[in-house]
Structure formats: C-alpha cells, structure tokens
Amino acid sequence: KSPVFGPQEVSSVEGNSVSIKCYYPPTSVNRHTRKYWCRKGASGRCITLVSSEGYVSSNYAGRANLTNFPENGTFVVNIAQLSRDDSGHYKCGLGINSRGLSFDVSLEVSQGPELPNGTEVYTVDVGRTVTIKCPFKTENAPKTKALYKKIGQTSVLVIDSRNYVNPNYKDRIRLRIPGTGQLIFTVVIDRLRLSDHGLYLCQAGDGSNRDEKNADLQVLEPEPELVYEDLRGSVTFHCALGLEVANVAKFLCRVNSRETCDVVINTLGKRDSAFEGRILLNPQDKDGSFSVVITGLRKEDEGRYLCGAHSDGQLQEGWPIQAWQLFVNEESTIPRSPTVVKGVAGGSVAVLCPYNPKESQSLKYWCLWEGAQNGRCPLLVESQGLVQEQYEGRLSLLQEPGNGTFTVILNQLTTQDAGFYWCLTNGDTRWRTTVEIKIIEGEPNLKVPGNVTAVLGETLNIPCHFPCKFSSYEKYWCKWSNTGCQTLPSQDEGPSEAFVNCDENSRLVSLTLNPVTRADEGWYWCGVKQGHFYGETAAVYVAVEEKKVAGSRYVSPAKADAAPDEKVLDSGVREIENKAIQDPRLFAEEKVVADTGDQAGGSRASVDSSSSEEQGGSSK
C-alpha cells in the first residue's frame, strides 16, 4: 500500500477554492523528489495539472499552485475559481505519475443553491448551536413571531411565540423576543442535526404588512482532520467540543464498515479491549476539551475517529463531534522493538525503548499504565533517577545502547509487575511506545544469595551463578543507586578455559568487597550483557554491621537469610541442599565465601569470574 495519504473526498461549490494536503514519509529522497497533482482520464493515464517543479497546466494557469513542506512531509495543492468541470478523480503523489507512490482523491464541485435575495446564510457543524436573527418593524412588535422551514413548496411551522414547538425540534429550540426598542427576535437551535439543513423563513405579523426574512441553514458534517502517524508510534486526538457540553460525558469512537461508531474510550469507564494498555483519556479542561493518547499504533488502528459528548458516552445524532482520518504509515522511522517482554518470578526483564535519535539529549521516562479512571501513567523512573520509592533496588533506566534506544531494567519480578509500561521522552511525543511485561513459569537464570549481612572491616564475597548459555556474555556486578547502577571495578575476564567446554551445571561470577565499609550497604546487581545490550540481572541487598564478638578466632563476615533447607556451617559458609527451592533468590550449591586472610592487599571491590568449583581463582 502506498505511504502517501490525503483526503479521499473533497467537495466544494462553484466559484470557491479548495486546499488539498497530502502527506508522505519525510525521508531525504521523498523530501526532494517531484510532487504532483494529476487528473485521471478514461484511459487510466494521469495527466499532470501542477507539480513542484513549476509546471502548471493551461487549465490551471493563474488559479492553482503546489507547495512542498519537506520539513513535515506534506505538500499542499490550492485550486481557486472552481467550476463544475473540475469535478473528477485525481491523484496526489511523488516521483513519476505512474509509479504508485500516490493517493486517490475525488473532487466534487456542486452548483451553489439558488437563494432568494437577502437570504442570510448560516454555516454550522452538526451538533453545534445556531442563532437565527429575525428583524421586524415596530408595528409587528406585538404580533406573533414564527420560524418556518421550507420543504419543497410548503412551509412547516418550527416554532412560534405562542409556545408551539415542532416535535422534531423538541428540547433543543427556543424563540427569544427582546425587550422594547429592539426590533429583532432570535431563534436558537441547539444540537443541530443534518436533517435541520435547509431554507428557513422568519415571520413577524401576518397579512400584507408582515415582516419576512429568509435564512439558509447549512449543517455540515465536520471535515475530518487528516492525521498521518508512523507504525508503532503514537497519536494524540485533541477534542474541543465547547462549553455547552463541558459537563457531559465524552467519548472517542471509530467508524466501522456499517457507518456506525464503536466506542474506543469514554469518560464513563468504557474502553475497547483492542486498545488495552495503550490508551489514555486525559482529563478535560474547564472548557470541556480533552485529549486521547494512543500508543503502539498498528495498521488496523487506521480509520475515521470521532470524538463527541453525550450522556450515554456514545455517538448520538445532534450532539457535537470532531473528526479525524488516521493513516498509519508502514514505512515507519520507529524501529521494531518487542511489544511483549517475558520474565519469571524472581527474575528480571530488560526493556528496549526507542526514541527519536535526533533527540539524544532528551529526558527519558518509563511509566506504568493503569486502566483505572480512563487510564493514567504514573512515572516509575526517569533518566534523572528513580521516581517511585517502592521500586528501590530493582529498577534502573540506562542511556545504553544509545542512538535511538534506551534500556529499562526491572528485577525481583513478581506477578504484580505484569502489565503495560510506556516508554517516553520529553521530546517528540509521536515516539511514545508501549511494552507489555508478562510473568511466566520458570526459574531465574542468575542466582544470588538472599539478603547478605557483611561485617565492617572484613572481606565479603558474594557469588552469582549463571548457566552455560551465558558463558559468552560479559558478566558484571554493579551497585544500584536511584540514579543508575554503577559498575564495580573488575578484571577483564577475557576468554576462559573454564567456559570453552561448558558442561557444568553453572558458572560463577563473584563480587568481593575488601574491606567492607559503611558505604557498601545497599543493593548490588549481578548481570550479563552483550556489548551495550543488557540481559538478565539479579539483585542482592548487603547490610553492614559491626563485629559482634571481639577477640574470637573467626567471625562470619557474611550472613544470608536462612531458608528451610539451609545448613549454616561452622565455617561461616552457608550451604543449601540441592532440593526444590521455594525462594527463587536461593539456589543449589550456594556458598557465601568468608575470606579472613590478609586484607591489606587486594582491591576494595572486585569481580571474580570462575567455575563453581574454582572459587578461589579468577578468570583472566
């Protein structure tokens, strides 16, 4: 399907002008290539009428032009002095007329209505309000005032000053007679319907002295605003319906093939399940305006959308509406990224979030979509740091890999973390994307102790087991803070013999803190990555306490939480029997190593990678 998009149907009246806007993907090639407007002939050929290269056909000379707006991927064709002969089928497009990078447009030019002299024309959108002004002479001031609608050769009474109201206008029409001295009465019709369209006659008095005034009421369906957005991107519909409906329920609906309108979301709590996790209805302003944000755009989201107001929260005739025609461009600049990320309880996920690469300095955000109250999205983390305290120690936003992608890591997963999350920046709002986190059955691949208690001044060694499938990955330990996770110094592992023939149950990367200080207290993450792409992580909390027993031969520098199948050995090393493990953060063959040897040497914090059986050696 062509990525060029424009209005399918354009209608106007003889002598008037039209402005036709066509959209295209703003790639550098498209921005600079030829743009054209051509008319389709009976032969199927499309004859150029105007192009961006300055060509204007003789038929269009002096009344048409084409302007390209390369910065936003649009071009506009203006045609003036329309005649009935301009009705027909056209194409707006890029490149060569026959190449298919185009959009079909139907133009219909109709004859203007023949109106009686002195007719006042009122042009109003459906659902809105019109005030028809009816002047009269002083002698008709005390006499009956009335408004009629002309239907063919007959006139049907709509309303009069004797309290008659035509049933078709019940509860939405009123006749106002001003105080003395003002020689004009008004008829106000609310919630206009398409059927209200037509010629009206104001009348004051009767007989040959009566005052008459013709009014032509044109009730228009709102012209849909064209919206051109990228696949996987985001769209915002801003809906301003006016103060009259400020306190009425609002909705956004999508027109279906039967020409009825299916509710997408409304303020009464209804939401189409197809938009679950990727839609928000923003609270309305005091003037009744509101907006709806949809992220993770799909091709099937294309179509005609209406927003409106009605107490039922759905489309009803005669209530104000606004319209959009959404086109979803498949030649998207927004890269593919997983829309569903799966993790296991106790494990972790690393979510890749795209952003506009031209906005590398923009602030990055991650929020959790909540369906309650028409949807809302509390921020969890920003590139400036953590926002929600309940995510302390288990959530971090990283600028890597950069160049249009940032990473969010969430670990210590529970079933409550399942849900929809939005990737955001403070820049281009069209790059808002949605990811769903699903919690599935399974065990975390990385296994670390439960919470660890370290002794001040001693050495602490924390193991992190990883399976063979991660043997080629880079392993790291980092200390979490609310502004990120600072990688701890580690010797460059390089290729290791231990990993070449990976046939053991698991491998080990150890964090050594030597000597333990008060500042070491906090969350530590063990993780794997490939270049700038992050994989799984596991978190462990290290508490620091004073030496408890003075002068004893041995003090365990590391105590981990006891679990049902644990033995705490005299040597100060915790061992867990190789049984089914209930706490996913506990693992088989775990050893928290206490090194009470010479602590003067060695680094403050080091990461040592080795096999389970070779905890003393480090892999170089």
């Epitope: 923003n282 609270p283 602030l363 921020l379 955001l424 403070n426």
Partner: nanobody, 124 residues
Framework: EVQLVESGGGLVQAGGSLRLSCAAS????????MGWFRQAPGKEREFVAR????????DYADSVKGRFTTSRDNAKNTVYLQMNGLKPEDTAVYYC?????????????????WGQGTLVTVSS
Amino acid sequence: EVQLVESGGGLVQAGGSLRLSCAASGRTINTYVMGWFRQAPGKEREFVARIDWSGSSTDYADSVKGRFTTSRDNAKNTVYLQMNGLKPEDTAVYYCAGSAYYSGYVTHRDFGSWGQGTLVTVSS
C-alpha cells in the same frame, strides 16, 4: 526527589491580585502534573488548582473558578498561580505540589512532592 519552592505571597486588599510562583529543582517537572493547595488557619488543606504535564488541561476548585488561573513554563521548571479578585476567605498558606504522572486522571491524593508554602493574606 523534586524540591518545590513557592514565592509571591503577601498582604493584599480584597479585590486585588497576586501571582504565586513555584520553582522546581532536583529534576525537571515537564512530565509532572502540578497542583496548588491551600490551608487556612484551623482548617484542612484543600485543593485549589491543577495543571497537566503539557499545560493543555487545567482544573479548579469551584470556589476559585473564574478568578484563579494556573499555568506553567516547562523551560523554566516553574508553575504559576495568578489570583485575581481576591477575597478575605482566600487567606491561607498556599502550597505547590507535584505528582509524577505522565498523563491521565490524577486525583488530589496522588500529589507526592510538596513545597513549604507561601502565606497569602487578604484584608477587607
């Protein structure tokens, strides 16, 4: 954590105007819903106004509708409350508050960051 500091309070005669400012530091607030609350002596803290992250949507307590207007300048990391037609019953300590919600329906309970407040006294 975002720090909020209110300024612009003072003594004003009934019918007069004041403009309160709320400057944020510590982080940008362009994705925060910002609110104004007030607490009169011996009374509970009450909602006055809120403005969404983009500035496109505002909401006011009935008692101040048509007289107070809130706005924001995300580039300056600042939120404003323009108070016109002040009445003696508007006398209170006015607090600025921030809520880390990117979008959507944010209730008055959702405000997590608070300023120290600025006193507004309206004399009759």
